[in-house]
Structures are given as C-alpha cells and as structure tokens.
C-alpha cells in the first residue's frame, strides 16, 4: 500500500503531503509520548513547533537534553518527550520544508493533554467543580 | 530562500544610540525566536540578545543588560536591537542569527551579513 | 558560565584535527560548532553535540561528555583552515568559546 493510504486513517489525518499521528495524546505526568510525520517525499528536514492556545501561532519549543528528541529517516520524523510535564500542554505540529521548492507542509498537529494536578490551587478547583 | 539582513550599523559616539534592524524572508517569522550576535574586530563571537517568536520573552548578556532592547515586529517580519549608552568596548559587527529548527536553544544556522557599529570620538 | 577552547591548532592535510571546548558539566548542554572564515558569517558545523546539518561533509563530527566537547576533523583539507567557535546554552542564554584557529600546514 501507499504511505499515503496507509497513514490517512487511522494513523493520521492527510495535510498537504504529511500525514501526522496521532492526532491525540493523553498522558499522566512524568510518562513518555512520541508523535511522529510520515511524509511522501525525504527531500526536506523536518521541525517541530507548539502552541499551547488556539489562536496563536506556534513557537519553537525549548532544547532539555534528555528530555526532548527529534529524528528522523526517510519517510519518518518522531518527535519524542520524555518525562512530561504540565507545561508541555499544546498541540505540535510537524512541518517540512521541502529543499527544492522551498514550500512549507504542515501537520494536521498532535496534541498532548498532561493529565493530573500541577498544583495544589488546581486541585483546589476541581473539587469545588465537583461539589 | 530564508534571508536576514541587518542594517543601522555606523559611527556613533560614545554615550549615544543607535537603532539596528533585521529584515527576515523565507519562513514565519512570528513562530521563530531571533538573536543578536557580535563580534568586536579581531575577536570572537559573543551572543548579545534572544527574543522569543511572540515577542514576550527577551534575554540579554550581561554586558548589555539595561542598556540594550531587543524587540520585533512580526507584521513587518523585523527584528531590532536598540542600543543606548553606548561604549567604545560595544565596537563590533552586529549579526542577526535563527536557530531555524524546532528549538529556539539550537544552533544558530540562520545568520545575516552582519552590520558594523563603531562607538568612537 | 565559560567555554574555553585552545587558541590554535595546526594540523597536516589529511590527518584528523582536533578542537577541544570545556566547560563544567558542558555534557549536561548541547554542544554546537561553527565555522568562520575571515570576511565572512558562522556556518555551523555541528548541533546538537553530534549532528551535521545538510550539506557539510561527513569528515566533520562532534562529542561532547563530562566537561568536554570535542569537534573532530578527519581528513583535513586545506579549505578546512578557518576560525571555530564552540557554543551552548546556560539556561536561557548563549554562551561562545573564544574561538580556535585551524591552520592547515
């Protein structure tokens, strides 16, 4: 099969010539989650941006060693992040820049919900949300 | 094809001011964090200033620190570096640099022409 | 935070030139490498402690553990001869070495 039959469903939705999955992470604290691009055509590095609100635009994201890695072969990029935390929140959205053309293909985007309480203010709200 | 190009550079005397500019083509501006980078004449690279795509976080050295602003337009796709109180050791070409990748702590594989800054009398 | 690296370094055509940069605990940042000959911008060699960006030859590399990261050119050319400067990340701000300078004999 073409990747790009088997990367529209379920994997991932088709944007442009990427196809990114999963379109959606839920996680506890402190686990690790990998989102990966597949892409039609290698001729091009592929990045990461996030946006934590909907109505911005997204930003690079900040280097941990250890905690953040990208890579990529030759139809796959995979970004992976390790010990998650409240603040990794958002939707990522892998981009490839094509060396050629030097048009930019954007993901569908992936977000990543961090489950559990950051702080204790939070935990305060939740209860008074329940009662 | 990702370009910057600094301007603003010249003569000034020390104690005055002087405004650079980077114009930016060939990505979203807005989603990347920008720096300044010097290099006074005869010596080596010095990191100056980074702010954020959105403009709302800046970080300086502390060489420059309350005396230089870095700021962005991200409609005009420019960068800026207004430098006050200016001294004779701030003497250098003045670069715009991008890490152009996923993160804005990379390596800075983006960089300008540069433009010279002379602080004299 | 402080990066320091040899002023010089000569090497023959063909053999393996080595830059060192130390810093405490650098192997606990990325490393990155850039190339400056006179008149012209960095080009940056080496990100990421170890990878090379497209289009510079394979013969570069890099490490970086302890205190110590390391650029390594194997079979060096004579357009190889330029200025090096090592570069991490305290925190939120960038910090150079002074720079080395390759002379290929």
């Known amino acids: 099969a073409r990747s790009e039959d088997r990367y529209r469903n379920p994997k991932g939705s088709a944007c442009s010539r990427i196809w990114q999955s999963p379109r959606f992470i839920a996680r506890k604290r402190g686990f690790t989650v990998k989102m990966h691009c597949y892409m039609n055509s290698a001729s091009g590095n592929v990045s990461w941006l996030w946006k934590q609100e909907m109505d911005e635009n997204p930003q690079q994201l900040k280097l941990e060693k250890g905690r953040m890695e990208e890579s990529q072969n030759e139809s796959l990029a995979t970004l992976t992040i390790q010990g998650i935390r409240f603040e990794d929140n958002g939707i990522y959205f892998c981009q490839q820049k094509c060396n050629n053309t030097s048009e930019v293909y954007q993901g569908c985007g992936t977000e990543l919900r961090v489950m559990g309480f950051s702080t204790l203010a939070q935990l305060k709200q939740r209860n008074t949300l329940k009662d | 094809e990702v370009q910057l190009v600094e301007s603003g550079g010249g003569l000034v005397q020390p104690g005055g001011s002087l405004r650079l500019s980077c114009a930016a083509s060939?990505?979203?501006?807005?989603?990347?964090?920008m720096n300044w980078v010097r290099q006074a004449p005869g010596k080596g690279l010095e990191w100056v200033s980074t702010?954020?795509?959105?403009?709302?976080?800046?970080y300086y050295a502390d060489s420059v620190k309350g005396r230089f602003t870095i700021s962005r337009d991200n409609s005009k796709n420019t960068l800026y570096l207004q430098m006050n109180s200016l001294r004779a050791e701030d003497t250098a070409v003045y670069y715009c640099?991008?890490?152009?990748?996923?993160?804005?702590?990379?390596?800075?594989?983006?960089w300008g022409q540069g433009t010279m800054v002379t602080v004299s009398s | 935070y402080e990066l320091t690296q040899p002023p010089s370094v000569s090497v023959s055509p063909g053999q393996t030139a080595s830059i060192t940069c130390s810093g405490d605990?650098?192997?606990?940042?990325?490393a990155s490498w850039y190339q400056q000959k006179p008149g012209q911008s960095p080009v940056v060699v080496i990100y990421?402690?170890?990878k090379r960006p497209s289009g510079i030859p394979e013969r570069f590399s890099g490490s970086n553990s302890g205190n110590t990261a390391t650029l390594t050119i194997s079979g060096t050319q004579a357009m190889d001869e330029a200025d090096y400067y090592c570069?991490?990340?305290?925190?939120?701000?960038?910090?150079f070495g002074g720079g080395t300078k390759l002379t290929v004999l």
């Open positions: 570069q991490a990340w305290d925190s939120n701000t960038a910090v």
């Open positions: 060939g990505f979203t501006f807005s989603s990347y964090a």
């Open positions: 640099a991008n890490p152009s990748g996923t993160f804005w702590n990379d390596a800075f594989d983006i």
């Open positions: 702010i954020s795509g959105s403009g709302g976080s800046s």
């Open positions: 990421q402690d170890t």
């Open positions: 605990k650098l192997g606990d940042e990325f």
